[in-house]
Structure formats: structure tokens, C-alpha cells
């Protein structure tokens, strides 16, 4: 058993049918010695008396808010949560496996640049009685500071019969140098509590591996005289690290017909312009990627050919 | 990328081309190592990230773009001097650029070159003959060093009398390649920045 926060405790259980569970001793936080009784949640049934209460915690029915009283007055509370260990592996019931970029990916994180700021998000089908708490650091043995905000509900979607909820959090490394070469990964730890169930999820990454630039901005077309060709131009996104000559991007320019089946013409360039043939009803799209370290491509920025 | 790519101008800052080749070569070598050594811990998540140049060179600090010198977090151990040197800078206005930066890059390359050659000698003794260093990568390191044209003492190739532990050598190869790729990215960024200046 360990303390998650004041008066909230996590009991770790080897979870299998007929498991013996864990013996837990609760102590009433009071100078009083006599006439103390214990109850669980809203029930008025007295579970025991005395300054301490010994319970055998086996199932969720044994978890909850234990309260000690004296003469009708509440003295203190202890909330017991359960953390299930199923065949040596901690349960992952609360969050959905996003399966990207690989199986067992519960937390996904992205950074728009090298400033040390990043966003993580996760999915769940649970709509109520759900709380999250996020901590982060650079490295784990001698951790350096990363400050995270509060997790917030950022999107709701309908997936088949289920509703899916997306939560996200923004974090900022306290003293980040954009040009630094990372040798210790960022660690992100999310505590999730649903009703009386506790779970924790972790992700470990280098900022360089989660970079995804914003799409190029100011995408414009300039027709070339007496030609079906157009000059496409764009700019680096505002959120990208500067100077751009040091943090360079490379670009992919794509001409896509109206139908998805039509052949796509693609050109790669390090410049912020390109000359392409603009077909009728086609659209031109441009996306960006770090020129030197191949992390994710940005989303496409698009303009119609007409 | 096997699709059309815009080619750089021929009159470019001479080292940029070499540094781009370097990054391509080390990236290819790392990919090859990860595929060949699939049963070894060779992914970024599995290895310890060690920098053999730590406390010996200060490339990141010495080559920091001027715009980032205002960032407190980037100035931990910065001791830059604005002097010009090295043939890469020959035909440019480089009054603001640091000789320290280019000599630091040169020292990095020299250190990695020695490590890689020592390692290759060990790998050649492996009866499994599983993996060797790409000669192209070693050649590209050499070319960039020549382009940088800094003279410094020759570092003798390390020789080891004990029987090599091939498992450890292959894991060390992965660690070295990961670290060298990160340094090659920094070198490429620096060269690109110098080219634009």
C-alpha cells in the first residue's frame, strides 16, 4: 500500500480468482483513543472499533472511503483505491491502446518544434468518475524539471456504438535549449483513477523523435505565362524553431486530382517554392519535415488549382 | 527518398555537401545495423545514449547560432571565440563565425573515425562475419575532415590484446552509430546555417 496523495492510498493486488488479497491496517488521524468506530462509504454499518482497523482487501467491494467517527463526528477519511496486477502485468483498463506507432501505445506525444514544449494525448471510452494527473521529467535517475498543465478533455468522437473521449496535456521542459543533443529521454507519467480503480501509464521519448511541424503557411500559386505550370510558394510555419537556416525543413509538394485513384505527382525540395503542372480540378498540397532528422511529416497545407 | 529532389547550387559552402553525405551515410549504416542486429538491443529505446566526445569537444555550444545565444539554457558551457579558419570558410564573409566550432567538428570526426576503425578491426575477427562498417561512411568522414582542413595530432588507433567480446562490440557499435547520427545532424544544421550566413 502506498499514498497517492493526502488520505488517498493505493492497494496493489495480485488479481486472480480466489486471491488472498492484501491485509491493510488503517489508522484514524486523531489524538482520540476511545469510542472510535469505522464505516465504509455511505453505509452506516460499523466495520470495527478502535483507533486502527484491519481489513483484508480482495476486491473492489473492499475499496472505497473508510471513515472513522466518534460520537457522530467525523474524525478522518482514508480512500482506498485498487491497482490490479494481472499475471505480473499492471492492468490497462482505463485507456485505449492507440496501436500507433506500435501496440501498447496508450500515450501519444508530439512537439511542433525544439523548444521543449510538447503535447500528449490519450483515449478512453469512460465518461464519468475519471481523473488524471500528469508528471514529467527529463531522465529518471537524476530527473530534470518538466512542467505539465492539467489534463483536459480535448475531443469527443463516436466510434461505432461507443463514444470515445480524448484527453490532452501540455508540458514544457523548464530549461530547454533547442540546439541541444538529447541523451536522456523525457519521461511522462499519467495517473488515472476511475471510480476505485487506479492505473498508471508511462511514455519515454526524445523530443527529436516526436517532432511534427505545423503545415507550411501562406501557400500560394502563381501561374507561369504561356504554360500549364504554376509556381507554388509557401513559408515556414510560425511555430517552427528559429533560425530556419539552422532548423531547416524539407518539403513534399503533391498534385492530387479530384479522384483519389488518380496518380499523384510528388516533388521533394528544400526550397520554399516549386514549379508544378496544375491539372484542372486538381489541388496542390505541401507538407514539411525536419530536413536532417526524419521524424513525422506535418499535415498537408492545400490550395485548389483553379 | 527515391523521388525527384531539387539539387543544391554548385557554388555552395564547400562543407555542406560533405556534411549531407555524412548524414546520409551514417543514417544508412544505422539502418543496416538495426536490421542486421535485430536480435541485439540496437533501437533508440533500448540502448544507452553515450557521447564519446562528452567533455572532450563542445560542438553544440561552440556552433550555437547567434540567435540562440540569448537563450540562457543554451549557454551552460559556452566559450566561443569569433575567429576564422579552415578551408570551408575560404570564400565567405565569416567574421562572425567561429574557428572553435569547425575545429570542434573536426575533433568529433577524428574521435569517431578512430572508434569506428578500432571497432571494424574487431568485427573483422568475428567468425559470424555478421556486420562490418560501411567503407563509404568511413570515406565520407575522411572527406569532411579533409574539407575542414584542420591540422591536429594523429590519434593512434586503439589496439586491444584481449579476445574481443563480439556481442559487446556489436552493442557498442549501435551506441556509437546512434550518437554519431545525432552529431551528424548537428553538423548538418551548422553547415546549413554557415552556408546561409
Amino acid at each position: 500500500i502506498w499514498e497517492l496523495k493526502k488520505d488517498v492510498y493505493v492497494v496493489e493486488l495480485d488479481w486472480y480468482p480466489d486471491a488472498p488479497g492484501e491485509m491493510v491496517v488503517l489508522t484514524c488521524d486523531t489524538p482520540e483513543e476511545d469510542g472510535i468506530t469505522w464505516t465504509l462509504d455511505q453505509s452506516s454499518e460499523v466495520l470495527g472499533s478502535g483507533k486502527t482497523l484491519t481489513i483484508q482487501v480482495k476486491e473492489f467491494g473492499d475499496a472505497g472511503q473508510y471513515t472513522c467517527h466518534k460520537g457522530g463526528e467525523v474524525l478522518s477519511h482514508s480512500l482506498l483505491l485498487l491497482h490490479k496486477k494481472e499475471d505480473g502485468i499492471w492492468s490497462t483498463d482505463i485507456l485505449k491502446d492507440q496501436k500507433e506507432p506500435k501496440n501498447k501505445t496508450f500515450l501519444r506525444c508530439e512537439a511542433k518544434n525544439y523548444s521543449g514544449r510538447f503535447t500528449c494525448w490519450w483515449l478512453t471510452t469512460i465518461s464519468t468518475d475519471l481523473t488524471f494527473s500528469v508528471k514529467s521529467s527529463r531522465g529518471s535517475s537524476d530527473p530534470q524539471g518538466v512542467t505539465c498543465g492539467a489534463a483536459t478533455l480535448s475531443a469527443e468522437r463516436v466510434r461505432g456504438d461507443n463514444k470515445e473521449y480524448e484527453y490532452s496535456v501540455e508540458c514544457q521542459e523548464d530549461s530547454a535549449c533547442p540546439a541541444a543533443e538529447e541523451s536522456l529521454p523525457i519521461e511522462v507519467m499519467v495517473d488515472a483513477v476511475h471510480k476505485l480503480k487506479y492505473e498508471n501509464y508511462t511514455s519515454s521519448f526524445f523530443i527529436r523523435d516526436i517532432i511534427k511541424p505545423d503545415p507550411p503557411k501562406n501557400l500560394q500559386l502563381k501561374p507561369l505565362k504561356n504554360s500549364r505550370q504554376v509556381e507554388v510558394s509557401w513559408e515556414y510555419p510560425d511555430t517552427w524553431s528559429t533560425p530556419h537556416s539552422y532548423f531547416s525543413l524539407t518539403f513534399c509538394v503533391q498534385v492530387q486530382g479530384k479522384s483519389k485513384r488518380e496518380k499523384k505527382d510528388r516533388v521533394f525540395t528544400d526550397k520554399t517554392s516549386a514549379t508544378v503542372i496544375c491539372r484542372k480540378n486538381a489541388s496542390i498540397s505541401v507538407r514539411a519535415q525536419d530536413r536532417y532528422y526524419s521524424s513525422s511529416w506535418s499535415e498537408w497545407a492545400s490550395v485548389p488549382c483553379s | 527518398r527515391n523521388l525527384p529532389v531539387a539539387t543544391p547550387d554548385p557554388g555552395m559552402f564547400p562543407c555542406l555537401h560533405h556534411s549531407q553525405n555524412l548524414l546520409r551515410a551514417v543514417s544508412n549504416m544505422l539502418q543496416k545495423a538495426r536490421q542486421t542486429l535485430e536480435f541485439y538491443p540496437c533501437t533508440s529505446e533500448e540502448i544507452d545514449h553515450e557521447d564519446i566526445t562528452k567533455d572532450k569537444t563542445s560542438t553544440v555550444e561552440a556552433c550555437l547560432p547567434l540567435e540562440l545565444t540569448k537563450n540562457e539554457s543554451c549557454l551552460n558551457s559556452r566559450e566561443t571565440s569569433f575567429i576564422t579558419n579552415g578551408s570551408c570558410l575560404a570564400s565567405r564573409k565569416t567574421s562572425f563565425m567561429m574557428a572553435l566550432c569547425l575545429s570542434s567538428i573536426y575533433e568529433d570526426l577524428k574521435m569517431y573515425q578512430v572508434e569506428f576503425k578500432t571497432m571494424n578491426a574487431k568485427l573483422l575477427m568475428d567468425p559470424k562475419r555478421q556486420i562490418f562498417l560501411d567503407q563509404n561512411m568511413l570515406a565520407v568522414i575522411d572527406e569532411l575532415m579533409q574539407a575542414l582542413n584542420f591540422n591536429s595530432e594523429t590519434v593512434p588507433q586503439k589496439s586491444s590484446l584481449e579476445e574481443p567480446d563480439f556481442y559487446k562490440t556489436k552493442i557498442k557499435l549501435c551506441i556509437l552509430l546512434h550518437a554519431f547520427r545525432i552529431r551528424a545532424v548537428t553538423i548538418d544544421r551548422v553547415m546549413s546555417y554557415l552556408n546561409a550566413s
Epitope: 480468482p17 486471491a19 496486477k85 494481472e86 499475471d87 505480473g88 501496440n103 | 538491443p41 533500448e46
Partner: antibody, heavy 115, light 112 residues
């Protein structure tokens, strides 16, 4: 006393369907994940499928994906395996088992796919 | 499609020490705990070892398990005639959990 009692096995022709049941007692069935495991005659153990305690997630071996469906009725304390488009290579003893460090197995039920 | 490899058979005379190996990889045994099962002819498997080296109550202490790196082993110290059975190791792969990964199985024969 944890008990898993299986039923539903038998002889079936290739291409036909069969449903296996596993009735649980002696524990809170709705709190635990459950597996199906099979063993072809003279062969080793092969995992078939898993279902979460609340039925929210199901996982299948590639060899049965799209043909077999694992399900549970927590109000009846019963686990099911619906097998469709059966093949000769599905012939095996099928076991249900609880998920956890200490597990309990059903007695097994024989499924024979033969024309 | 078995990823955990066991020797097909091992044998020993009563009282001898018999060991069965189970060889896997970094993503299974290297990352997860190992279990061992005993299966007597015509019966369901019975758990012998969980968590690499833990014995459930009721399992004789002549059975012991261990794990090192990407391999595990089961030892029967002082093998007895009633130990003649098939033995299976089991683990998980970190990418496909909760799918059970079973070993190929080992037939233990007690001679004489």
C-alpha cells in the same frame, strides 16, 4: 472453490459452426479476464482468444481471427466461443481458463472437425 | 508459430536432477514473467511455477523455476515416477499481450 465447467464440444463437418460454453462458479466472474486455449491431438498448447472482464476488448490468434468470436454473459457467469467456418485443423481439445498469476482451467471439451 | 523453444524430450532416473530450458527473445521472456505447466495425459495443464520462480501452494518444492535474460528453465530436483508428463513454459510478448505465448513443450520421461 473456483470451478469452470465446459460444454458444447462434438463432431462437426468442415465449414459448419459450433458454440462452446464455460460455466464459472466460486468467484466473481465479472471481475476477471478469460482465455480459450486449445490442444490438437498429440500437439502442444495454443492460445485462441481472450476477453476482458467487462467484454470491452477481445483478442484473437491469427489462425482463428474472423472465424471465432469470444463473448461472455456476466449475468450468467458464462464464457462462450462461437466457432464458424470450421476446418480440419481446428480439431482439438478446447480449454477455458482464468487470467492471472494463479489460473484455473476447465476440464476441456473435444471438438472434431471431420467430413 | 511457437516463439518459445523447449527441448522435445528430457529424461532421468528417479532421484536425478532434470532441467528443461525455454528460450525466447527480448520482447517476450526478456520483458515478461514466465510460467511453467505440467500436463498429465488426458488432463488439463496444472500450474507449477508463476512469476519466473514462484511456486503455488501445493506444488512440491522439488520443482523450481529461474529466468536469465531471454531464457527460463524449470528444474526437478530428485525426479519421481509421477513427474513423467509434458511440461510447457508460457510468457507474453510485450506487443501482443494478453495473448498467451506457449513453449513447444517437453516430454519428461522417468527411466527405470
Amino acid at each position: 472453490q473456483v470451478q469452470l465447467v465446459q460444454s458444447g464440444g462434438g463432431v462437426v463437418q468442415p465449414g459448419r459452426s459450433l458454440r462452446l460454453s464455460c460455466a464459472a462458479s466460486g468467484f466473481t466472474f465479472s471481475s476477471y479476464g478469460m482465455h480459450w486455449v486449445r490442444q490438437a491431438p498429440g500437439k502442444g498448447l495454443e492460445w485462441v482468444a481472450f476477453i476482458r472482464y467487462d467484454g470491452s476488448n477481445k483478442y484473437y490468434a491469427d489462425s482463428v481471427k474472423g472465424r471465432f468470436t469470444i463473448s461472455r454473459d456476466n449475468s450468467k457467469n458464462t464464457l462462450y466461443l462461437q466457432m464458424k467456418s470450421l476446418r480440419a485443423e481446428d480439431t482439438a481439445v478446447y480449454y477455458c481458463k482464468t487470467h492471472g498469476s494463479h489460473d484455473n482451467w476447465g476440464q476441456g471439451t473435444m471438438v472434431t472437425v471431420s467430413s | 508459430s511457437y516463439v518459445l523453444t523447449q527441448p522435445p524430450s528430457v529424461s532421468g532416473t528417479p532421484g536425478q536432477r532434470v532441467t528443461i530450458s525455454c528460450s525466447g527473445g527480448r520482447s517476450n521472456i526478456g520483458s515478461n514473467a514466465v510460467k511453467w505447466y505440467q500436463q498429465l495425459p488426458g488432463t488439463a495443464p496444472k500450474l507449477l511455477i508463476y512469476g519466473n520462480d514462484q511456486r503455488p501452494s501445493g506444488v512440491p518444492d522439488r520443482f523450481s523455476g529461474s529466468k536469465s535474460g531471454t531464457s527460463a528453465s524449470l528444474a526437478i530436483t530428485g525426479v519421481q515416477a509421477e513427474d513423467e508428463a509434458d511440461y510447457y513454459c508460457q510468457s507474453y510478448d510485450r506487443g501482443t499481450h494478453p495473448a498467451l505465448l506457449f513453449g513447444t513443450g517437453t516430454k519428461v520421461t522417468v527411466l527405470g
